[in-house]
Structure formats: structure tokens, C-alpha cells
């Protein structure tokens, strides 16, 4: 839960030629109020809803008489904030309508008369919790200077209004697996407490009291394990009784975008992809131009091209779609190499990168052997971030310091006895057996078992061993 | 009628910079980008970059963006584009052009660089 | 950045014959693509936008046509005016980029 906040700033004639006439006069005073609609920017109801997050309207301002033959000037304002209470998360994502009205003060029949002067609106990325930010809207020839936050109401805390802070229990820290509340840090996070008895390994929830299924799992307490096999179709609302999916129309069936947008499934509901010039859940908001703010996560909005697109967005590294509103998953391109991991800090990729490689992408092989001796005539070896000798007859270990006893694994089959040589070592083999590491056992009648031709050899070839 | 009128041709040295105008007409000229375009002597086309001049925005193509830097004066509904450290590779005919469906684009203004 | 890649890079056609002219993109613009026609000395002249609009005042024997990375321009039947250098723009992404042109001459 938390509060969103409105400050006008001014309500006035914009820049440019073409000022437009004041509202009131002498004959007809009048006075202005602000009405703000707000719509969560991504949701499913900010198409039908009118205003799924909240409204506000403003209290009256000063009664304002124009002064003859004097331009508009920014005209008198109500005092005070427009706040608009949310109960749930904060979006993140939202879009907002502000409307200026002017309350006709003069004699009419039936007391005020009201009429809309200007109408704003625009999509915003906002994080609760954040600094006020300031904005500047134009509509027709009237200038609006505003800004607006998102607050959380305590016990919320965070981004979104959905972690909870109560205050310490213990004076030294906080519960197991539980923060400290940043910037309370004499308060902890609260535990999330889920509906009674929803399951823990297949349901969760995002406010208290509730109870979500992962997908598979159904039921009231995400008990009930999803089971198609008697069902004729694999989507649909899920029966509580028997746990099966009901046959039912595809989030994209009939396809829901509209102006030509493409529709895509995801896990809880669809995704329009819209063409440019049109943005919305559905696609269905258009007329826009680079005056509403099309542009999302720092986008720059220049003009279309089409004219059935008054503006396109330049996104920045790191965004994309026609409104710069999707995340591009640049590791998903897996920009690293040689086993570097991958993090994506938003305004950069950053690889961290195995031992032994170095680089932006962990391009780069580190020289292994780098200042790494090997003793006794061994040579280094490089690979995979480490280094290894391969060592000279005679010698082991790491560096090849040690001196190796060659007979040390046995290497002599069939009783042969092993002697340590200058070049390796010799089999003295048993009555009965020859060969190099005497393998081979010899036959009465003086014919040996020996293979009909061993690797690299021809029948008939002279076969020598030690 | 849409109109846009460019600076005269140019002559400059290797190393100087220069400053080419295109001044539209006939359209209301914060509505729509005005786009700037080079095409060297047998050549192609080349995009340079745009400037948007309801807000200012500039989008450069990024193999101009240390020669070129585009400017808009609103006042006089005029577009500039100033093109620095001049070597003989800049030589080329440059369009000012609102690169939209009507498509309408200035005469090209001539610059040879040489010493 | 996009690349264009324009063909034939020169035609010589008779007159009344159909000539067709091909772009194709590395990757798809959504047809974000238009045509232009540039005679010797002159600015070019938008032909077509959006891959197959024409442009007011331009003759119906041009036309345009494709989706994804294969587009087409066609003159249906030549005329002596229609010659010069033709080249396609894409404006899908920036940086927008140009085809390499194709000169067309009478035979």
C-alpha cells in the first residue's frame, strides 16, 4: 500500500507564438481544478478500467479575474498535493491523465458551469520510494509544470510496496533470513505471511493473505497438481474439484491486439507488440505524440516516418520495443567467453571471467605459463586458465621436481621384474611371457599369442620389443 | 509548399570545419525530423543523422557523430549541420531532407575539401 | 547497423519493358523501407514509403512489394523519364541505412 503524489507547479501559457486567452474575465471569474487518473501501465485492466490505480481531484483554486487586455498569465492554483491511495504493489509502470477544469463563477442558472481546459497524459517508469520527479506537459497552447512520486505506506517498504518492516524484536540485528529495512535500519523485514496452509513448495504469494500457484499446481492452497490428461485442452480456468484444466479460449485467441499488433502468450496472460505510433496493453492507445511522453526508460522520441506514426523512440542500450518499454536479456546472447559469466548492470554488460582469461568478453587467454618454470627439461603446457608441465623421462609432479621411480606402478605384467632406466624402464619378464611390459604370454610350440598386427603395423612386419 | 533551401557550395582546407544551413518553409517546422544525408562523388547514400526540433532530440548515425553536429533555430525555422576536422574523404554533396512519407529534401550543398 | 544490399547495381532495359529492383535487409525492418529516384544532378525523390505506399504524384507504374528482409521495386512499363539511380532506405532502426543504388538506362 502506498500513496501517489501530484504537485502542480504551474498551469499557464505555453511557449511559442499563439498564447491562448485567459479563461475567465471580469464578467465570467472563474476558478481552476486538476483531476488525476492514474492506470497501471502494463496491467490487463488499463485498457477497460478507467482508472485501475486511483483517482484524485484537486480543491479549487483562488477565484481569478483577467485583467483587461493583459495576456494568460499562469493562472492561480489550488493549494496542496492530489494524492491517490493504492492498496496493492506499486506498478512500476504506470500511465496518467491530467485534466485542468475551470468552475465558472457567474450567474448561471443552476449554480457553476465546468468545462475541461487541457488534457495531458503520458506512460511513466517510477519506483517507489524515489525523489520527486519533475515533468512538463503541453496541450494545445497551455503549458503544465508538475511533479509527482510514489510513496510507500508503512509498513511497506521497497520499489513496489511489497516487502513489510516491522520494528526489531531484538536490538543487534534481525530475524533469520530477514534484512534490515533500508533506509529504517532499526526496522526488519517482515516475514510475508501467505493464506493458511497454502503450500510452500507450490504456491506463494506477493501481499499478505494470499495464495498464487506456480504453474502446474491449482487449488485454493496450490494442492492440486494439474492433470490434462483427461482433459480436452490444455488451457483454460482450472476446475478446484478435480484439478483439471477446463477447456477454454488462448489468451490470444481472437487476438486481442489491436492497430495491427502482434500478439504473444506468456506464462500468466499475453503481450501485445505494438506497431509504432500506438501503445497500450492492447494497442489501443494512438494520437500519441512526442508531447505525451511515449518514451520509456530514458528513450528519446524523435518524429515517425509514417503517418500513421507521429513519433518513434530511440532506445537506449540495454531497451527495446516501440516505446523502448521491454528489457533487452543482452546475456542472452552470451556475450562472454571461454565460461566468463555474464551480469547485465542495466547501463552495461559486465563478463566475469575464468581463471585465466581476461578481456571485456573474456576474450582474451592469459599466458599460463607466464613466468612458470618447469625443472628438469619440462615443458609447460597451457590450458583452461592453468598451467601444467609435461615433464621429462624420469621426472613428475607439478613443476617436475620430483624424481620419478618408473616402476613405482608396477608397470611390469605377469611376475616381470621392473629396472629403472636412463630412458624409462625395462621388463625382465617371467619364463613363459614377453613383450615390453612382458604382455604377451609365449606358446609351447614357439608360436606367441601376439595380436595379428598391432596398431601401425603390417603382417609380416619384424616385431621387436625390449 | 514544402521547401528547403541550402547553403552554397564550399571550399575549405583539410582540418577547418564548416557550417552548412537548410532553412524550410511552407510546413510547421517543430511537426516533423529533419534528416541529414551525404553522398559522396559515384557514391550512395549515407544517413548522418536527424534532429527533431519540437524537443531538440538528436539521433546521430554513430560513424558521423565526431564529424557532425546538428543544431535547429527554431525562431528562423532553420536547420544546421557543422562538420569538423575536414579531410578530402568529406567531400560530398550534403542533403537536408524531412525523410517522411512525402519525402521532401533540400538542393545538396557542394563541399570539396582540399588544399 | 542494418545492411542493405541492392541489386541489380546497373539495368539496361527497352522501353515499355518491366524492370524490378530488389532490396534485401540482414535482418527484418517490418517493412520500414522506401524507394527514391535521383537523377543526374538532381535530389533524390521519394517514390514509395512503408514497402508498398506510393507517394502523391507519383505514376502508378511504380510500385512496390515485400515483408521481412525482401523487398521489390517494379516500373511496369518503362518510360524514357524514369531514368537515373534508384535506392532504398530502411528506417526500421537507426542508424537508417541506404541500398548501394542501381542505375537505370534505356537500351
Known amino acids: 500500500a502506498g500513496v501517489f503524489e501530484l504537485q502542480i507547479h504551474s498551469f499557464g501559457p505555453g511557449p511559442g507564438p499563439g498564447a491562448p486567452r485567459s479563461p475567465c474575465s471580469a464578467r465570467l471569474p472563474c476558478r481552476l481544478f486538476f483531476r488525476v487518473c492514474l492506470k497501471p501501465g502494463l496491467s490487463e485492466e488499463a485498457a477497460e478500467s478507467p482508472c485501475a490505480l486511483g483517482a484524485a481531484l484537486s480543491a479549487r483554486g483562488p477565484v481569478y479575474t483577467e485583467q483587461p487586455g493583459a495576456p494568460a498569465p499562469d493562472l492561480p492554483l489550488p493549494d496542496g498535493l492530489l494524492q491517490v491511495p493504492f492498496r496493492d504493489a506499486w506498478p512500476g509502470t504506470f500511465s496518467f491523465i491530467i485534466e485542468t477544469w475551470r468552475e465558472e463563477l457567474g450567474d448561471q442558472i443552476g449554480g457553476p458551469a465546468w468545462s475541461l481546459l487541457a488534457r495531458v497524459a503520458g506512460r511513466r517508469r517510477l519506483a517507489a520510494g524515489g525523489p520527486w520527479a519533475r515533468d512538463i506537459q503541453r496541450a494545445g497552447a497551455w503549458e503544465l509544470r508538475f511533479s509527482y512520486r510514489a510513496r510507500c505506506e508503512p509498513p511497506a517498504v521497497g520499489t513496489a510496496c511489497t516487502r513489510l518492516c516491522r520494528p526489531r524484536s531484538a536490538p543487534s540485528r534481525c530475524g533469520p533470513g530477514l534484512r534490515p529495512c533500508a533506509p529504517l535500519e532499526d526496522e526488519c523485514e517482515a516475514p510475508l505471511v501467505c493464506r493458511a496452509g497454502c503450500s510452500p513448495e507450490h504456491g506463494f504469494c506477493e501481499q499478505p493473505g494470499e495464495c498464487r500457484c506456480l504453474e502446474g499446481w491449482t487449488g485454493p492452497l496450490c494442492t492440486v497438481p494439474v492433470s490434462t490428461s483427461s482433459c480436452l485442452s490444455p488451457r483454460g480456468p482450472s476446475s478446484a474439484t478435480t484439478g483439471c484444466l477446463v477447456p477454454g479460449p488462448g489468451p490470444c485467441d481472437g487476438n486481442p491486439c489491436a492497430n495491427g499488433g502482434s500478439c504473444s502468450e506468456t506464462p500468466r496472460s499475453f503481450e501485445c507488440t505494438c506497431p509504432r505510433g500506438f501503445y497500450g496493453l492492447r494497442c489501443e492507445v494512438s494520437g500519441v505524440t512526442c508531447a505525451d511522453g511515449p518514451c520509456f526508460n530514458g528513450g528519446l522520441c524523435v518524429g515517425g516516418a509514417d503517418p500513421d506514426s507521429a513519433y518513434i523512440c530511440h532506445c537506449p542500450p540495454g531497451f527495446q520495443g516501440s516505446n523502448c518499454e521491454k528489457r533487452v536479456d543482452r546475456c542472452s546472447l552470451q556475450p562472454c567467453r571461454n565460461g566468463g559469466l555474464c551480469l547485465d548492470l542495466g547501463h552495461a554488460l559486465r563478463c566475469r571471467c575464468r581463471a585465466g582469461f581476461a578481456g571485456p568478453r573474456c576474450e582474451h587467454d592469459l599466458d599460463d605459463c607466464a613466468g612458470r618454470a618447469c625443472a628438469n627439461g619440462g615443458t609447460c603446457v597451457e590450458g583452461g586458465g592453468a598451467h601444467r608441465c609435461s615433464c621429462a623421462l624420469g621426472f613428475g609432479g607439478r613443476d617436475c621436481r620430483e624424481r620419478a621411480d618408473p616402476c613405482a606402478a608396477r608397470p611390469c605384467a605377469h611376475g616381470g621384474r621392473c629396472y629403472a632406466h636412463f630412458s624409462g624402464l625395462v621388463c625382465a619378464c617371467a619364463p613363459g611371457y614377453m613383450g615390453a611390459r612382458c604382455e604377451f604370454p609365449v606358446h609351447p610350440d614357439g608360436a606367441s599369442a601376439l595380436p595379428a598386427a598391432p596398431p601401425g603395423l603390417r603382417p609380416g612386419d619384424p616385431q621387436r620389443y625390449l | 509548399e514544402v521547401q528547403f533551401q541550402q547553403s552554397g557550395p564550399e571550399l575549405v582546407k583539410p582540418g577547418a570545419s564548416v557550417k552548412i544551413s537548410c532553412k524550410a518553409s511552407?510546413?510547421?517546422?517543430?511537426?516533423?525530423?529533419i534528416h541529414w544525408v551525404r553522398q559522396s562523388q559515384g557514391k550512395s547514400l549515407e544517413w548522418i543523422g536527424l534532429i527533431y526540433p519540437f524537443n531538440g532530440g538528436i539521433v546521430y548515425n554513430q560513424k558521423f557523430k565526431s564529424k557532425a553536429t546538428l543544431t535547429v533555430d527554431n525562431s528562423s525555422t532553420s536547420a544546421y549541420m557543422e562538420l569538423r576536422s575536414l579531410s578530402s574523404e568529406d567531400s560530398a554533396v550534403y542533403f537536408c531532407?524531412?525523410?517522411?512519407?512525402?519525402?521532401?529534401w533540400g538542393q545538396g550543398s557542394t563541399l570539396i575539401v582540399s588544399s | 547497423d542494418i545492411k542493405m544490399t541492392q541489386s541489380p547495381s546497373s539495368i539496361y532495359a527497352f522501353l515499355g519493358e518491366r524492370v524490378t529492383i530488389t532490396c534485401k535487409a540482414s535482418?527484418?525492418?517490418?517493412?520500414?523501407l522506401s524507394w527514391f529516384q535521383q537523377k543526374p544532378g538532381k535530389s533524390p525523390k521519394t517514390l514509395i514509403y512503408r514497402a508498398n505506399r506510393l507517394v502523391g504524384g507519383v505514376p502508378s507504374r511504380f510500385s512496390g512489394s515485400g515483408s521481412g528482409q525482401d523487398y521489390s521495386l517494379t516500373i511496369s512499363s518503362l518510360e524514357y523519364e524514369d531514368v537515373g539511380d534508384y535506392y532504398c532506405l530502411q528506417y526500421a532502426e537507426f542508424p537508417y541505412t541506404f541500398g548501394g543504388g542501381t542505375k537505370l538506362e534505356i537500351k
Open positions: 531532407a524531412r525523410l517522411n512519407w512525402e519525402g521532401y
Open positions: 511552407g510546413y510547421t517546422f517543430t511537426d516533423y525530423n
Open positions: 535482418q527484418d525492418i517490418n517493412s520500414y
